[in-house]
Interface confidence: medium
């Protein structure tokens, strides 16, 4: 199996009640605007075939996509939460910048690409859905990277 290196986040990143609450509130606000409840971006299909030792690397890819393609373009929405949560997630992304997999990561890229394609296909509602799943992103990072 591919070996992941530097794919760790300190537990303290997830022990800050204020930013945790703001992240979850942002997700809630966005999910209220999400009419497509049948589609789940961060779910079984994303994790399929990816072992737990590779999961942090997978979530890093999802985090980076979410920041660059969703949160930055939508940064004027869902205030005041967005202006606090985006820098926090960007710091997590920066801390995972040296997280790599030695070996073939095609199976991971394939799963991430499906998530990206779904968001793109849904257009703005896909971006809203991705923001509405920030709680899942947060918890999946916590579960995989500590």
């Amino acid at each position: 199996a591919p070996i992941s290196s530097h794919c760790r986040l300190d537990k303290s990143n997830f022990q800050q009640p204020y930013i945790t609450n703001r992240t979850f509130m942002l997700a809630k606000e966005a999910s209220l605007a999400d009419n497509n409840t049948d589609v789940r971006l961060i779910g079984e299909k994303l994790f399929h075939g990816v072992s737990m030792s590779e999961r942090c690397y997978l979530m890093k890819q999802v985090l980076n996509f979410t920041l660059e393609e969703v949160l930055f373009p939508q940064s004027d929405r869902f205030q005041p939460y967005m202006q606090e949560v985006v820098p926090f997630l960007a710091r997590l992304s920066n801390r995972l910048s040296t997280c790599h997999i030695e070996g073939d990561d095609l199976h991971i890229q394939r799963n991430v690409q499906k998530l990206k394609d779904t968001v793109k296909k849904l257009g703005e509602s896909g971006e809203i859905k991705a923001i509405g799943e920030l709680d899942l992103l947060f918890m999946s990072l916590r579960n995989a990277c500590i």
Epitope: N21, M25, A27, S31, G43, F47, M52, D135, S140, A144
Partner: antibody, heavy 121, light 110 residues
Framework: EVQLVESGGGVVRPGGSLRLSCAAS????????MNWVRQAPGKGLEWVSG????????DYAASVKGRFTISRDNAKNSLYLQMNSLRAEDTALYYC??????????????WGRGTLVTVSS | QAVLTQPSSVSGSPGQSITISCTGA?????????VSWYQQHPGKTPKLIIY???KRPSGVSNRFSGSKSGNTASLTISGLQAEDESDYYC??????????FGGGTKVTVL
């Protein structure tokens, strides 16, 4: 076939300790978060504690925090619950439960048959 | 003490539809889509029948459906059958990284 087999239950006096074990088989143990859920006789379900795949995060219900410790040994495909300072209200059937899919540590898709803990003087 | 509130009992005749409610707070059911439902027959282990508010695990009858509005989640059983007589529990994940359950609802098929 997924199998979860709990052991270690028994009768203990208030203030005493017990260590529960859960032997897992039929799946890649370290791909899943694991949990303990309890059910007092004739009562409803109560989540007790959960641990992520590598033991890095351990979460507890407020009612057991500071008294119970969850741990896992991936090499032995085993989950544990160390219970200290036991109280009468801890009397229950303790279930070992696995996430429904690998990313869902909060949905309990597979359950053991449970091990009974009785706290009585 | 259950954190989520469910009716203690609900009954219906065979073929009917029944709905079980599960009321939480803004920090659990109201905030996130991490609601699940479990069926538990007497003397048996619980069985996951709904997750992600409205998704069914493979093998679970499509007579079971879930939904959520505000702080209240609901489980609907359509075409009620004798084997549906059981206890049902709702559950939600929370922002404090804990899981909360409802007190359970006993479903009786008349």
């Amino acid at each position: 076939e997924v199998q979860l087999v709990e052991s270690g239950g028994g009768v203990v006096r208030p203030g005493g300790s017990l260590r529960l074990s859960c032997a897992a088989s039929g799946f890649t143990f370290d791909d899943y978060g694991m949990n303990w859920v309890r059910q007092a006789p004739g009562k409803g379900l109560e989540w007790v504690s959960g641990v992520n795949w590598n033991g890095g995060t351990r979460d507890y219900a407020a009612s057991v925090k500071g008294r119970f410790t969850i741990s896992r040994d991936n090499a032995k495909n085993s989950l544990y619950l160390q219970m200290n300072s036991l109280r009468a209200e801890d009397t229950a059937l303790y279930y070992c439960a696995r996430g429904w899919y690998s990313g869902s540590f909060y949905y309990f898709g597979y359950w053991g048959r449970g091990t009974l803990v009785t706290v009585s003087s | 003490q259950a954190v989520l509130t469910q009716p203690s009992s609900v009954s219906g005749s065979p073929g009917q539809s029944i709905t079980i409610s599960c009321t939480g707070a803004s920090g659990d059911v109201g905030a996130y889509n991490f609601v699940s439902w479990y069926q538990q027959h007497p003397g048996k282990t619980p069985k996951l029948i709904i997750y992600d508010v409205n998704k069914r695990p493979s093998g679970v009858s499509n007579r079971f459906s879930g939904s959520k509005s505000g702080n209240t989640a609901s489980l609907t059983i359509s075409g009620l059958q004798a084997e549906d007589e059981s206890d049902y529990y709702c559950s939600s994940y929370t922002s404090t990284f804990s899981v909360v359950f409802g007190g359970g609802t006993k479903v009786t098929v008349l």
